[in-house]
Protein backbone atom coordinates (compact mmCIF):
# COMPACT_ATOMS: atom_id res chain seq x y z
CA UNK A 1 0.00 0.00 0.00
CA UNK A 2 1.45 3.55 -0.53
CA UNK A 3 0.26 6.87 -1.47
CA UNK A 4 0.19 8.34 -5.11
CA UNK A 5 2.91 10.78 -4.97
CA UNK A 6 1.32 13.81 -7.64
CA UNK A 7 -0.43 16.05 -7.40
CA UNK A 8 -0.38 16.54 -3.70
CA UNK A 9 -3.65 15.51 -1.81
CA UNK A 10 -5.96 18.72 -0.83
CA UNK A 11 -8.76 18.74 1.43
CA UNK A 12 -9.45 22.14 2.06
CA UNK A 13 -12.42 23.89 0.63
CA UNK A 14 -14.65 27.17 0.44
CA UNK A 15 -15.15 27.64 4.09
CA UNK A 16 -12.84 25.52 5.83
CA UNK A 17 -8.85 25.61 6.22
CA UNK A 18 -7.52 22.04 5.50
CA UNK A 19 -4.21 19.93 5.13
CA UNK A 20 -3.77 16.27 4.55
CA UNK A 21 -0.88 14.83 6.70
CA UNK A 22 0.54 11.32 7.15
CA UNK A 23 -0.42 9.11 10.15
CA UNK A 24 0.45 6.34 11.74
CA UNK A 25 -3.11 5.20 12.36
CA UNK A 26 -3.43 6.04 16.32
CA UNK A 27 -4.69 9.31 16.43
CA UNK A 28 -4.07 11.25 19.90
CA UNK A 29 -8.06 10.91 20.88
CA UNK A 30 -7.38 7.33 21.03
CA UNK A 31 -4.84 7.69 24.03
CA UNK A 32 -6.40 11.22 25.55
CA UNK A 33 -10.10 10.50 25.06
CA UNK A 34 -12.06 13.81 24.89
CA UNK A 35 -15.69 14.81 26.25
CA UNK A 36 -17.69 16.16 23.65
CA UNK A 37 -16.62 14.26 19.79
CA UNK A 38 -18.82 14.48 16.33
CA UNK A 39 -21.30 12.29 14.89
CA UNK A 40 -20.01 9.66 12.08
CA UNK A 41 -19.53 10.36 8.33
CA UNK A 42 -22.16 9.36 6.16
CA UNK A 43 -22.94 7.91 2.66
CA UNK A 44 -19.15 6.83 2.47
CA UNK A 45 -18.32 5.52 -1.88
CA UNK A 46 -15.87 3.94 -2.82
CA UNK A 47 -14.88 3.88 -6.69
CA UNK A 48 -11.75 2.32 -8.43
CA UNK A 49 -10.38 5.44 -9.75
CA UNK A 50 -7.56 5.92 -11.84
CA UNK A 51 -4.74 8.58 -11.54
CA UNK A 52 -1.19 9.26 -12.91
CA UNK A 53 2.26 9.41 -11.65
CA UNK A 54 4.64 12.36 -11.84
CA UNK A 55 6.80 9.89 -14.28
CA UNK A 56 3.26 9.39 -16.07
CA UNK A 57 2.64 5.93 -14.86
CA UNK A 58 -1.11 4.99 -14.48
CA UNK A 59 -2.47 3.51 -11.24
CA UNK A 60 -5.33 2.16 -9.93
CA UNK A 61 -7.17 4.16 -6.57
CA UNK A 62 -9.62 4.24 -4.38
CA UNK A 63 -11.52 7.10 -4.58
CA UNK A 64 -13.08 7.28 -1.09
CA UNK A 65 -16.12 10.25 -0.95
CA UNK A 66 -17.77 10.55 1.96
CA UNK A 67 -20.43 13.47 3.60
CA UNK A 68 -21.43 14.88 6.76
CA UNK A 69 -24.30 14.20 8.80
CA UNK A 70 -26.24 17.77 9.62
CA UNK A 71 -26.04 18.35 13.12
CA UNK A 72 -24.67 20.19 15.80
CA UNK A 73 -21.86 18.27 15.61
CA UNK A 74 -19.86 19.40 13.45
CA UNK A 75 -18.79 22.14 15.74
CA UNK A 76 -16.47 19.41 17.19
CA UNK A 77 -14.91 17.86 14.50
CA UNK A 78 -11.60 18.55 14.10
CA UNK A 79 -10.87 16.35 11.10
CA UNK A 80 -10.99 12.88 9.81
CA UNK A 81 -8.61 9.34 9.58
CA UNK A 82 -8.72 7.58 6.81
CA UNK A 83 -7.21 4.19 6.82
CA UNK A 84 -7.13 1.41 4.10
CA UNK A 85 -6.22 -2.12 5.27
CA UNK A 86 -5.40 -4.75 2.84
CA UNK A 87 -7.27 -7.88 4.16
CA UNK A 88 -4.94 -10.57 2.66
CA UNK A 89 -1.57 -8.94 3.84
CA UNK A 90 -3.68 -7.20 7.04
CA UNK A 91 -1.07 -4.28 6.00
CA UNK A 92 -2.78 -0.52 6.88
CA UNK A 93 -1.87 3.12 5.33
CA UNK A 94 -3.70 5.65 7.18
CA UNK A 95 -3.82 9.69 6.50
CA UNK A 96 -5.04 12.06 8.36
CA UNK A 97 -7.03 15.29 7.40
CA UNK A 98 -6.27 18.35 9.65
CA UNK A 99 -8.87 21.01 10.03
CA UNK A 100 -6.94 24.54 10.53
CA UNK A 101 -10.76 26.46 10.95
CA UNK A 102 -13.87 25.45 12.38
CA UNK A 103 -16.78 24.34 10.60
CA UNK A 104 -19.47 27.04 11.79
CA UNK A 105 -22.82 25.72 8.90
CA UNK A 106 -24.86 23.75 6.89
CA UNK A 107 -25.02 26.33 4.04
CA UNK A 108 -24.55 23.25 1.89
CA UNK A 109 -23.69 19.74 2.93
CA UNK A 110 -20.18 19.14 3.48
CA UNK A 111 -18.27 16.78 1.25
CA UNK A 112 -15.05 15.50 1.20
CA UNK A 113 -12.92 12.87 -1.14
CA UNK A 114 -9.58 11.90 -1.20
CA UNK A 115 -8.09 10.25 -3.90
CA UNK A 116 -4.53 8.89 -2.94
CA UNK A 117 -4.62 5.69 -2.16
CA UNK A 118 -3.06 3.25 -4.91
CA UNK A 119 -4.47 -0.30 -4.64
CA UNK A 120 -3.05 -3.46 -6.39
CA UNK A 121 -4.97 -5.38 -9.13
CA UNK A 122 -7.28 -8.29 -7.81
CA UNK A 123 -7.13 -7.46 -4.05
CA UNK A 124 -9.50 -6.27 -0.93
CA UNK A 125 -9.47 -4.12 0.79
CA UNK A 126 -11.21 -2.59 3.84
CA UNK A 127 -11.79 1.48 3.53
CA UNK A 128 -12.12 3.37 6.85
CA UNK A 129 -13.11 7.73 7.70
CA UNK A 130 -13.34 8.17 11.51
CA UNK A 131 -14.12 11.61 12.19
CA UNK A 132 -11.96 13.18 15.01
CA UNK A 133 -11.59 13.26 17.90
CA UNK A 134 -12.21 9.32 18.43
CA UNK A 135 -14.77 8.51 21.05
CA UNK A 136 -14.68 8.28 24.36
CA UNK A 137 -14.48 4.62 24.97
CA UNK A 138 -18.03 3.42 25.29
CA UNK A 139 -19.18 6.22 22.78
CA UNK A 140 -21.01 6.01 19.90
CA UNK A 141 -18.97 4.74 17.07
CA UNK A 142 -17.95 7.64 14.87
CA UNK A 143 -16.56 5.86 11.94
CA UNK A 144 -18.12 4.48 8.93
CA UNK A 145 -16.19 1.60 6.55
CA UNK A 146 -16.95 -0.27 3.36
CA UNK A 147 -15.46 -3.35 1.57
CA UNK A 148 -13.48 -2.86 -1.61
CA UNK A 149 -12.79 -5.12 -4.51
CA UNK A 150 -10.37 -4.05 -6.92
CA UNK A 151 -10.82 -5.89 -10.37
CA UNK A 152 -8.05 -7.92 -12.33
CA UNK A 153 -6.27 -7.12 -15.18
CA UNK A 154 -8.37 -9.01 -17.24
CA UNK A 155 -11.04 -5.84 -16.34
CA UNK A 156 -10.78 -2.92 -19.40
CA UNK A 157 -9.47 -0.25 -17.71
CA UNK A 158 -7.26 -2.14 -15.11
CA UNK A 159 -5.08 -4.18 -18.15
CA UNK A 160 -3.64 -0.43 -19.34
CA UNK A 161 -2.70 0.08 -15.74
CA UNK A 162 1.66 0.38 -14.94
CA UNK A 163 1.09 -2.98 -13.00
CA UNK A 164 -1.25 -4.74 -14.90
CA UNK A 165 1.29 -3.85 -17.88
CA UNK A 166 4.20 -4.93 -15.60
CA UNK A 167 2.65 -8.60 -15.84
CA UNK A 168 1.97 -8.71 -19.13
CA UNK A 169 -1.89 -7.21 -19.31
CA UNK A 170 -1.06 -6.73 -23.06
CA UNK A 171 -0.53 -10.02 -24.11
CA UNK A 172 -3.09 -11.27 -25.99
CA UNK A 173 -2.11 -14.87 -27.08
CA UNK A 174 -5.24 -15.58 -28.63
CA UNK A 175 -4.69 -19.73 -27.63
CA UNK A 176 -5.96 -22.28 -29.90
CA UNK A 177 -6.37 -25.65 -29.34
CA UNK A 178 -7.02 -28.20 -32.40
CA UNK A 179 -7.25 -32.04 -31.49
CA UNK A 180 -5.13 -34.51 -33.80
CA UNK A 181 -4.98 -37.94 -34.56
CA UNK A 182 -3.18 -40.21 -32.67
CA UNK A 183 -3.82 -38.99 -29.56
CA UNK A 184 -1.98 -35.50 -29.88
CA UNK A 185 -3.22 -31.70 -29.33
CA UNK A 186 -2.14 -28.90 -31.81
CA UNK A 187 -1.97 -25.49 -29.42
CA UNK A 188 -1.02 -22.44 -31.47
CA UNK A 189 -0.41 -18.91 -29.82
CA UNK A 190 0.95 -15.48 -30.55
CA UNK A 191 4.18 -14.99 -29.34
CA UNK A 192 4.89 -11.25 -27.90
CA UNK A 193 7.08 -9.25 -28.46
CA UNK A 194 10.11 -9.77 -26.10
CA UNK A 195 13.03 -12.23 -26.34
CA UNK A 196 11.72 -14.46 -23.64
CA UNK A 197 11.11 -18.12 -23.12
CA UNK A 198 7.85 -19.59 -22.47
CA UNK A 199 5.92 -22.85 -20.74
CA UNK A 200 3.30 -24.59 -21.80
CA UNK A 201 1.09 -26.92 -18.92
CA UNK A 202 -0.90 -29.44 -20.27
CA UNK A 203 -3.13 -30.43 -17.73
CA UNK A 204 -6.33 -33.70 -18.91
CA UNK A 205 -8.41 -35.24 -16.36
CA UNK A 206 -11.43 -37.25 -16.43
CA UNK A 207 -14.89 -36.27 -17.97
CA UNK A 208 -16.46 -34.53 -14.80
CA UNK A 209 -13.89 -34.83 -12.28
CA UNK A 210 -11.19 -32.10 -11.21
CA UNK A 211 -8.48 -34.32 -10.21
CA UNK A 212 -5.62 -34.48 -12.89
CA UNK A 213 -4.87 -37.78 -14.56
CA UNK A 214 -2.03 -36.41 -16.58
CA UNK A 215 0.03 -33.43 -16.54
CA UNK A 216 2.89 -32.27 -19.14
CA UNK A 217 5.31 -29.57 -19.28
CA UNK A 218 6.88 -28.11 -22.39
CA UNK A 219 9.43 -25.54 -22.83
CA UNK A 220 9.46 -23.50 -25.43
CA UNK A 221 12.49 -21.17 -25.84
CA UNK A 222 12.83 -17.52 -26.44
CA UNK A 223 11.71 -16.69 -29.83
CA UNK A 224 14.29 -14.81 -32.03
CA UNK A 225 13.53 -10.44 -32.62
CA UNK A 226 12.05 -11.40 -36.37
CA UNK A 227 9.38 -14.27 -34.47
CA UNK A 228 7.27 -11.56 -32.61
CA UNK A 229 4.01 -11.28 -33.01
CA UNK A 230 4.21 -14.80 -34.78
CA UNK A 231 2.06 -17.87 -34.13
CA UNK A 232 4.37 -20.86 -32.40
CA UNK A 233 2.99 -23.92 -33.12
CA UNK A 234 3.53 -26.75 -30.55
CA UNK A 235 2.21 -30.48 -30.79
CA UNK A 236 1.95 -32.31 -28.02
CA UNK A 237 1.34 -36.16 -27.38
CA UNK A 238 -1.11 -36.84 -25.22
CA UNK A 239 -0.66 -40.67 -22.86
CA UNK A 240 -3.62 -42.86 -23.89
CA UNK A 241 -5.45 -43.01 -20.50
CA UNK A 242 -9.48 -44.64 -20.20
CA UNK A 243 -11.76 -41.62 -19.67
CA UNK A 244 -8.77 -38.96 -19.37
CA UNK A 245 -10.26 -36.53 -21.94
CA UNK A 246 -10.32 -32.87 -21.05
CA UNK A 247 -7.49 -31.31 -21.61
CA UNK A 248 -6.76 -27.71 -19.84
CA UNK A 249 -3.59 -25.98 -21.72
CA UNK A 250 -1.54 -22.93 -19.75
CA UNK A 251 0.90 -20.67 -20.79
CA UNK A 252 2.91 -18.90 -18.73
CA UNK A 253 5.37 -16.10 -20.20
CA UNK A 254 8.20 -15.03 -18.02
CA UNK A 255 8.69 -11.20 -19.47
CA UNK A 256 11.50 -9.61 -17.42
CA UNK A 257 8.93 -6.87 -15.79
CA UNK A 258 7.43 -9.84 -14.04
CA UNK A 259 9.58 -13.20 -14.27
CA UNK A 260 7.80 -16.10 -12.39
CA UNK A 261 4.65 -14.16 -11.85
CA UNK A 262 3.59 -12.87 -15.23
CA UNK A 263 -0.47 -13.37 -16.32
CA UNK A 264 -0.73 -17.13 -17.39
CA UNK A 265 -3.30 -17.63 -20.18
CA UNK A 266 -5.75 -21.16 -20.53
CA UNK A 267 -7.41 -22.72 -23.09
CA UNK A 268 -9.71 -25.96 -22.45
CA UNK A 269 -10.41 -28.95 -24.73
CA UNK A 270 -13.91 -30.32 -23.60
CA UNK A 271 -14.12 -34.16 -23.70
CA UNK A 272 -15.96 -35.74 -26.95
CA UNK A 273 -19.70 -35.70 -26.64
CA UNK A 274 -21.00 -38.91 -24.96
CA UNK A 275 -22.95 -41.63 -27.26
CA UNK A 276 -26.53 -41.71 -25.73
CA UNK A 277 -26.34 -45.63 -25.30
CA UNK A 278 -22.70 -45.85 -24.52
CA UNK A 279 -21.40 -49.75 -23.31
CA UNK A 280 -21.58 -50.66 -19.48
CA UNK A 281 -18.63 -50.27 -17.57
CA UNK A 282 -18.35 -52.45 -15.22
CA UNK A 283 -18.16 -51.29 -11.35
CA UNK A 284 -14.64 -51.50 -10.51
CA UNK A 285 -13.16 -50.46 -13.79
CA UNK A 286 -10.73 -47.51 -13.17
CA UNK A 287 -10.83 -44.38 -14.50
CA UNK A 288 -7.45 -44.51 -16.20
CA UNK A 289 -4.66 -47.05 -15.74
CA UNK A 290 -1.16 -46.07 -15.56
CA UNK A 291 1.02 -47.62 -18.42
CA UNK A 292 2.60 -50.91 -16.91
CA UNK A 293 5.33 -50.73 -14.50
CA UNK A 294 4.62 -47.00 -13.82
CA UNK A 295 2.58 -46.44 -10.74
CA UNK A 296 1.87 -42.66 -10.90
CA UNK A 297 0.16 -40.08 -13.47
CA UNK A 298 2.67 -36.95 -13.27
CA UNK A 299 4.57 -36.02 -16.15
CA UNK A 300 8.01 -37.22 -16.75
CA UNK A 301 9.80 -37.96 -20.00
CA UNK A 302 8.21 -41.21 -21.33
CA UNK A 303 4.89 -40.11 -20.55
CA UNK A 304 4.10 -37.52 -22.75
CA UNK A 305 6.29 -35.57 -25.75
CA UNK A 306 6.33 -32.83 -28.26
CA UNK A 307 8.09 -30.49 -30.61
CA UNK A 308 7.38 -26.90 -31.64
CA UNK A 309 7.67 -24.31 -34.57
CA UNK A 310 7.15 -20.77 -35.02
CA UNK A 311 4.92 -19.95 -37.73
CA UNK A 312 6.01 -17.20 -40.04
CA UNK B 1 -6.37 -24.63 -12.53
CA UNK B 2 -7.15 -23.19 -9.33
CA UNK B 3 -8.11 -26.25 -7.17
CA UNK B 4 -9.69 -26.42 -3.08
CA UNK B 5 -9.48 -29.98 -1.91
CA UNK B 6 -11.09 -30.43 1.40
CA UNK B 7 -10.42 -33.60 3.88
CA UNK B 8 -12.86 -36.39 3.96
CA UNK B 9 -16.75 -36.53 5.85
CA UNK B 10 -16.51 -36.64 9.62
CA UNK B 11 -19.00 -37.54 12.49
CA UNK B 12 -18.91 -36.43 15.52
CA UNK B 13 -19.76 -36.46 19.07
CA UNK B 14 -21.74 -32.86 20.65
CA UNK B 15 -19.01 -31.75 22.67
CA UNK B 16 -16.07 -32.71 20.55
CA UNK B 17 -14.10 -30.80 17.94
CA UNK B 18 -13.83 -30.95 14.39
CA UNK B 19 -10.82 -30.10 12.11
CA UNK B 20 -11.30 -29.55 8.25
CA UNK B 21 -8.61 -29.11 6.12
CA UNK B 22 -8.37 -27.36 2.48
CA UNK B 23 -5.81 -27.47 0.07
CA UNK B 24 -4.88 -24.91 -1.96
CA UNK B 25 -2.97 -25.34 -5.77
CA UNK B 26 -2.92 -23.83 -8.89
CA UNK B 27 -2.32 -20.08 -7.59
CA UNK B 28 0.18 -18.61 -4.82
CA UNK B 29 -1.47 -19.42 -2.19
CA UNK B 30 -0.32 -16.21 0.02
CA UNK B 31 -1.93 -13.44 -2.65
CA UNK B 32 -5.46 -14.63 -1.24
CA UNK B 33 -7.37 -15.29 1.71
CA UNK B 34 -9.17 -18.45 2.26
CA UNK B 35 -13.04 -18.01 4.04
CA UNK B 36 -15.09 -20.41 4.99
CA UNK B 37 -19.11 -21.20 4.36
CA UNK B 38 -21.21 -23.52 6.55
CA UNK B 39 -24.86 -24.87 4.76
CA UNK B 40 -27.02 -26.78 7.23
CA UNK B 41 -29.05 -29.43 5.03
CA UNK B 42 -31.25 -27.81 3.03
CA UNK B 43 -30.84 -24.31 4.68
CA UNK B 44 -28.98 -21.71 3.29
CA UNK B 45 -25.01 -20.53 3.35
CA UNK B 46 -23.70 -18.91 6.68
CA UNK B 47 -20.61 -17.27 6.42
CA UNK B 48 -17.75 -18.39 9.58
CA UNK B 49 -14.98 -16.20 8.93
CA UNK B 50 -11.69 -16.11 6.62
CA UNK B 51 -7.71 -15.92 7.17
CA UNK B 52 -5.44 -14.02 5.69
CA UNK B 53 -3.08 -16.49 3.78
CA UNK B 54 -0.04 -14.05 4.09
CA UNK B 55 -0.41 -12.73 7.45
CA UNK B 56 -2.61 -15.26 9.46
CA UNK B 57 -5.12 -12.49 10.06
CA UNK B 58 -8.63 -13.37 10.66
CA UNK B 59 -12.61 -12.02 11.10
CA UNK B 60 -14.68 -14.65 12.75
CA UNK B 61 -18.52 -14.19 12.44
CA UNK B 62 -19.77 -13.19 15.85
CA UNK B 63 -21.85 -16.01 16.82
CA UNK B 64 -18.81 -18.45 16.31
CA UNK B 65 -16.24 -16.68 18.18
CA UNK B 66 -14.52 -18.27 20.57
CA UNK B 67 -15.44 -21.54 19.35
CA UNK B 68 -13.77 -21.27 15.74
CA UNK B 69 -10.15 -20.88 14.94
CA UNK B 70 -8.54 -20.93 11.29
CA UNK B 71 -5.20 -21.31 10.72
CA UNK B 72 -2.67 -22.11 7.58
CA UNK B 73 0.07 -23.90 6.27
CA UNK B 74 1.88 -22.00 4.01
CA UNK B 75 4.52 -24.58 3.36
CA UNK B 76 2.03 -26.81 1.79
CA UNK B 77 -0.92 -24.34 0.69
CA UNK B 78 -3.36 -25.78 3.52
CA UNK B 79 -6.55 -23.98 5.74
CA UNK B 80 -7.44 -25.45 8.32
CA UNK B 81 -10.64 -24.71 9.97
CA UNK B 82 -11.46 -26.24 13.98
CA UNK B 83 -14.72 -25.78 15.43
CA UNK B 84 -15.33 -27.02 18.66
CA UNK B 85 -18.04 -27.73 21.50
CA UNK B 86 -19.88 -29.28 18.72
CA UNK B 87 -23.66 -29.20 18.65
CA UNK B 88 -26.02 -31.16 16.52
CA UNK B 89 -26.70 -27.64 15.16
CA UNK B 90 -23.26 -27.15 13.54
CA UNK B 91 -23.97 -30.63 11.44
CA UNK B 92 -23.28 -29.18 7.59
CA UNK B 93 -21.30 -28.95 4.68
CA UNK B 94 -18.44 -26.93 5.43
CA UNK B 95 -16.86 -25.32 2.06
CA UNK B 96 -14.05 -23.49 2.05
CA UNK B 97 -13.70 -20.94 -0.78
CA UNK B 98 -10.56 -18.23 -1.99
CA UNK B 99 -10.33 -14.74 -1.50
CA UNK B 100 -11.80 -12.80 1.73
CA UNK B 101 -14.82 -10.40 -0.06
CA UNK B 102 -16.08 -12.32 -2.90
CA UNK B 103 -15.34 -16.72 -3.33
CA UNK B 104 -14.24 -16.97 -6.71
CA UNK B 105 -13.15 -20.54 -6.13
CA UNK B 106 -14.82 -23.28 -3.52
CA UNK B 107 -13.86 -26.38 -2.51
CA UNK B 108 -15.98 -29.73 -2.56
CA UNK B 109 -17.48 -29.19 0.48
CA UNK B 110 -16.67 -31.39 4.12
CA UNK B 111 -20.02 -32.95 5.62
CA UNK B 112 -19.61 -32.86 9.53
CA UNK B 113 -22.57 -34.99 11.10
CA UNK B 114 -23.17 -33.97 14.88
CA UNK B 115 -24.59 -36.89 16.03
CA UNK B 116 -25.09 -38.60 19.98
CA UNK C 1 -25.35 -7.08 10.34
CA UNK C 2 -27.17 -6.30 6.84
CA UNK C 3 -29.94 -8.97 5.96
CA UNK C 4 -30.14 -9.75 2.58
CA UNK C 5 -33.71 -10.93 1.43
CA UNK C 6 -34.12 -12.63 -1.89
CA UNK C 7 -37.47 -13.43 -3.34
CA UNK C 8 -39.55 -15.28 -5.05
CA UNK C 9 -38.36 -18.14 -2.59
CA UNK C 10 -39.34 -20.51 -5.21
CA UNK C 11 -39.86 -19.93 -9.15
CA UNK C 12 -41.35 -22.32 -11.34
CA UNK C 13 -40.66 -22.08 -15.14
CA UNK C 14 -39.82 -23.35 -17.86
CA UNK C 15 -36.56 -23.95 -20.18
CA UNK C 16 -36.51 -20.86 -22.97
CA UNK C 17 -38.05 -18.34 -20.32
CA UNK C 18 -36.28 -15.58 -18.98
CA UNK C 19 -36.34 -15.14 -15.80
CA UNK C 20 -35.53 -12.52 -12.89
CA UNK C 21 -34.65 -12.89 -9.54
CA UNK C 22 -34.45 -10.62 -7.25
CA UNK C 23 -32.06 -9.80 -3.93
CA UNK C 24 -32.98 -6.62 -1.76
CA UNK C 25 -30.38 -5.68 1.36
CA UNK C 26 -31.54 -4.10 4.46
CA UNK C 27 -28.99 -1.11 3.56
CA UNK C 28 -27.12 -0.05 0.90
CA UNK C 29 -24.67 -2.10 -0.10
CA UNK C 30 -23.57 -0.20 -3.05
CA UNK C 31 -22.59 -2.69 -5.63
CA UNK C 32 -20.57 -4.96 -3.50
CA UNK C 33 -22.91 -7.84 -4.43
CA UNK C 34 -22.01 -11.22 -5.49
CA UNK C 35 -24.53 -14.25 -7.11
CA UNK C 36 -23.98 -17.82 -6.87
CA UNK C 37 -25.24 -20.58 -8.58
CA UNK C 38 -26.28 -23.93 -6.30
CA UNK C 39 -26.76 -27.93 -7.26
CA UNK C 40 -27.92 -30.52 -5.00
CA UNK C 41 -24.49 -31.82 -3.47
CA UNK C 42 -22.57 -29.23 -5.58
CA UNK C 43 -20.88 -26.41 -4.22
CA UNK C 44 -22.11 -22.48 -5.20
CA UNK C 45 -20.56 -21.56 -8.47
CA UNK C 46 -19.89 -17.62 -8.84
CA UNK C 47 -21.66 -16.33 -11.51
CA UNK C 48 -21.61 -12.33 -11.15
CA UNK C 49 -19.59 -9.99 -8.67
CA UNK C 50 -19.68 -6.13 -8.23
CA UNK C 51 -23.59 -6.75 -8.69
CA UNK C 52 -22.89 -7.00 -12.64
CA UNK C 53 -19.79 -8.25 -13.73
CA UNK C 54 -19.75 -12.12 -14.61
CA UNK C 55 -17.58 -14.09 -13.42
CA UNK C 56 -14.82 -15.87 -15.28
CA UNK C 57 -16.97 -18.67 -17.81
CA UNK C 58 -20.46 -17.41 -16.80
CA UNK C 59 -22.24 -17.59 -20.12
CA UNK C 60 -23.82 -13.95 -21.23
CA UNK C 61 -27.35 -15.30 -20.67
CA UNK C 62 -26.38 -14.29 -16.75
CA UNK C 63 -26.84 -11.07 -16.10
CA UNK C 64 -26.84 -8.60 -12.99
CA UNK C 65 -27.93 -5.32 -12.41
CA UNK C 66 -29.23 -2.87 -9.26
CA UNK C 67 -26.93 -1.01 -6.89
CA UNK C 68 -27.48 0.13 -3.37
CA UNK C 69 -30.11 -1.89 -1.82
CA UNK C 70 -32.23 -3.55 -4.77
CA UNK C 71 -30.56 -5.90 -7.17
CA UNK C 72 -31.61 -8.17 -9.93
CA UNK C 73 -30.34 -11.82 -11.30
CA UNK C 74 -31.77 -12.37 -14.75
CA UNK C 75 -31.46 -15.11 -16.81
CA UNK C 76 -32.02 -14.48 -20.53
CA UNK C 77 -33.47 -17.64 -21.84
CA UNK C 78 -33.39 -20.68 -19.31
CA UNK C 79 -31.29 -23.36 -20.26
CA UNK C 80 -31.87 -27.00 -18.38
CA UNK C 81 -28.94 -26.71 -16.82
CA UNK C 82 -29.97 -23.36 -15.22
CA UNK C 83 -32.20 -25.11 -12.66
CA UNK C 84 -30.67 -24.73 -9.35
CA UNK C 85 -30.48 -22.30 -5.95
CA UNK C 86 -29.53 -19.20 -6.44
CA UNK C 87 -27.62 -17.25 -3.51
CA UNK C 88 -26.82 -13.48 -3.57
CA UNK C 89 -24.32 -12.23 -1.33
CA UNK C 90 -23.28 -9.26 -0.22
CA UNK C 91 -19.28 -7.82 1.19
CA UNK C 92 -20.50 -4.35 1.58
CA UNK C 93 -19.72 -4.83 5.42
CA UNK C 94 -18.99 -7.62 7.88
CA UNK C 95 -20.36 -9.75 8.30
CA UNK C 96 -20.51 -11.19 5.37
CA UNK C 97 -24.30 -11.91 4.48
CA UNK C 98 -25.89 -14.30 2.00
CA UNK C 99 -29.57 -14.39 0.97
CA UNK C 100 -32.02 -17.60 1.78
CA UNK C 101 -31.64 -18.24 -2.09
CA UNK C 102 -34.47 -18.58 -4.53
CA UNK C 103 -34.82 -22.55 -5.83
CA UNK C 104 -35.63 -22.43 -10.02
CA UNK C 105 -37.57 -25.34 -10.79
CA UNK C 106 -38.68 -26.92 -13.77
CA UNK C 107 -42.91 -25.65 -14.37
Known amino acids: LRLLDFPAPVCAQEGLSCRVKNSTCLDDSWIHPRNLTPSSPKDLQIQLHFAHTQQGDLFPVAHIEWTLQTDASILYLEGAELSVLQLNTNERLCVRFEFLSKLRHHHRRWRFTFSHFVVDPDQEYEVTVHHLPKPIPDGDPNHQSKNFLVPDCEHARMKVTTPCMSSGSLWDPNITVETLEAHQLRVSFTLWNESTHYQILLTSFPHMENHSCFEHMHHIPAPRPEEFHQRSNVTLTLRNLKGCCRHQVQIQPFFSSCLNDCLRHSATVSCPEMPDTPEPIPDYMPLWEPRSGSSDYKDDDDKGSSHHHHHH | QVQLVQSGAEVKKPGASVKVSCKASGYTFTRYGISWVRQAPGQGLEWMGWISAYSGNTNYAQKLQGRVTMTTDTSTSTAYMELRSLRSDDTAVYYC?????????WGQGTLVTVSS | EIVMTQSPATLSVSPGERVTLSCRAS??????LAWFQQKPGQAPRPLIY???TRAAGIPARFSGSGSGTDFTLTISSLQSEDFAVYYC?????????FGGGTKVEIK
Open chain 3, 50 to 52: DAS
Open chain 3, 27 to 32: QSVSSN
Open chain 2, 97 to 105: ARRQLYFDY
Open chain 3, 89 to 97: QQYDNWPLT
